[in-house]
């Protein structure tokens, strides 16, 4: 069998709402994946499990089942949404995200995704991790790849 390539493209949109009394931020983050099947037979994308972390705390999880079948030598773009909650333990974030004197309320989130594919009864898991900027101060739609967080401390490629 040839490889199945999973490429995390980035955040497509982030829709935000707030609970002022609970000092809680609700972010619905839609992400985009490209999955390429380099085989001469179809593969099934059985499930996608995703997790979002903020400051090493898991703030959201999602799981999609029986997603699609990708034909031979084909590629499919898949969107998946992770509902996230930045709760009161991080109530300082509520003030940051709602402060009108700040123009862009970008926070850095770690997106983790695992794609499980099956073919001929065989199962394969491919995982990706990526840091992304998300604006927690307003509803935002992104050009794909626009939200990527490039850590200046990373060694240059």
């Amino acid at each position: 069998p040839r490889s199945i390539d999973v490429k995390y493209i980035g955040v497509k949109s982030a829709y935000v709402s707030y609970d002022v009394q609970k000092r809680t931020i609700y972010l619905n983050i839609t992400n985009t994946l490209n999955i390429t099947n380099n085989n001469y037979y179809s593969v099934e994308v059985e499930n996608i499990t995703a997790q979002v972390q903020f400051s090493k705390t898991v703030i959201g999880k999602a799981r999609l089942n029986n997603i699609t079948i990708i034909g031979p030598l084909d590629m499919k773009q898949i969107d998946y949404t992770v509902p996230t909650v930045i709760a009161e333990e991080m109530s300082y974030m509520y003030d940051f995200c709602t402060l009108i004197s700040i123009k862009v309320h970008n926070i850095v989130l770690m997106m983790q995704v695992t794609v499980t594919t099956t073919y001929f009864g065989h199962s394969e898991q491919i995982s990706q991790e990526r840091y992304q900027y998300v604006d927690c101060g307003r509803n935002t739609t992104y050009q794909l790849g626009q939200s990527e967080y490039l850590n200046v401390l990373q060694p240059q490629q």
Epitope: D19, V20, Q21, K22, R23, Y92, Y94, D95, T98, L99
Partner: antibody
Framework: QVTLKESGPGILQPSQTLSLTCSFS??????????VSWIRKPSGKGLEWLAH???????RYNLFLKSRLTVSKDTSSNQVFLMITSVDTTDTATYYC????????????WGQGTSLTVSS | QIILTQSPAIMSASLGEEITLTCSAS?????VHWYQQKSGASPKLLIY???NLASGVPSRFSGSGSGTFYSLTISSVEAEDAADYYC????????FGGGTKLEMK
């Protein structure tokens, strides 16, 4: 119109448990975003926030008193309750319940208060 | 826990005088609210969100501030303004300031 009214025992002995009731009208605590807090004022001192209950039964407590406090509600009878265990003389105060309106973080309506004296 | 420190603890004012009460936060917060409590009465909302006047509050009251420093100003004090004034924050672990007692000279 919105009204809140507190009721309590008036006098307790040290180590007893205080039970307070806040009866309200003019709003529903099942409405999304609503909340009710308990606040007290010891004579000659400032206001001290104690506990808050949200429309969805979520709760918050004063960090320093958390182990002694229990807040609860009965939505159908429009009542909020506060229990304080092991009272002592420092709990002598006027106790208020106050409403926090829908998606607000300030108290727009207050009860008249109920006085508690802890004495042996 | 955020500590709100109000000063002065007691203030004496003459009728018609402009006075300012201050509220200092131990950490930066987005805004504060102010309550007035007259003797023997319940607290009453005066100003919310640092500078917004609550319904029915006379325009001689105003609020300002940001970060760690907030203030309440009464432009021309009247006899009925004699009361305790409290600032309040709901940002991090909900606290009230210690209060300022306003007395008439």
């Amino acid at each position: 119109q919105v009204t809140l009214k507190e009721s309590g025992p008036g006098i307790l002995q040290p180590s007893q448990t205080l039970s307070l009731t806040c009866s309200f009208s003019g709003f529903s605590l099942s409405t999304s975003g609503m909340g009710v807090s308990w606040i007290r004022k010891p004579s000659g001192k400032g206001l001290e926030w104690l506990a808050h209950i949200f429309w969805d039964d979520d709760k918050r407590y004063n960090l320093f008193l958390k182990s002694r406090l229990t807040v609860s509600k009965d939505t159908s009878s429009n009542q909020v309750f506060l229990m304080i265990t092991s009272v002592d003389t420092t709990d002598t105060a006027t106790y208020y319940c106050a409403r926090m309106g829908r998606q607000r973080d300030y108290f727009d309506y207050w009860g008249q208060g109920t006085s508690l004296t802890v004495s042996s | 826990q955020i500590i709100l420190t109000q000063s002065p603890a007691i203030m004496s004012a003459s009728l018609g005088e402009e006075i300012t009460l201050t509220c200092s936060a131990s950490l930066s917060i987005s805004y504060v609210h102010w309550y007035q409590q007259k003797s023997g009465a319940s607290p009453k909302l005066l100003i919310y969100g640092t500078s917004n006047l609550a319904s029915g509050v006379p325009s001689r009251f105003s609020g300002s501030g940001s970060g760690t420093f907030y203030s309440l100003t009464i432009s021309s004090v009247e006899a009925e303004d004699a009361a305790d004034y409290y600032c309040h924050q709901w940002s991090i672990y909900r606290t009230f300031g210690g209060g300022t007692k306003l007395e008439m000279k």
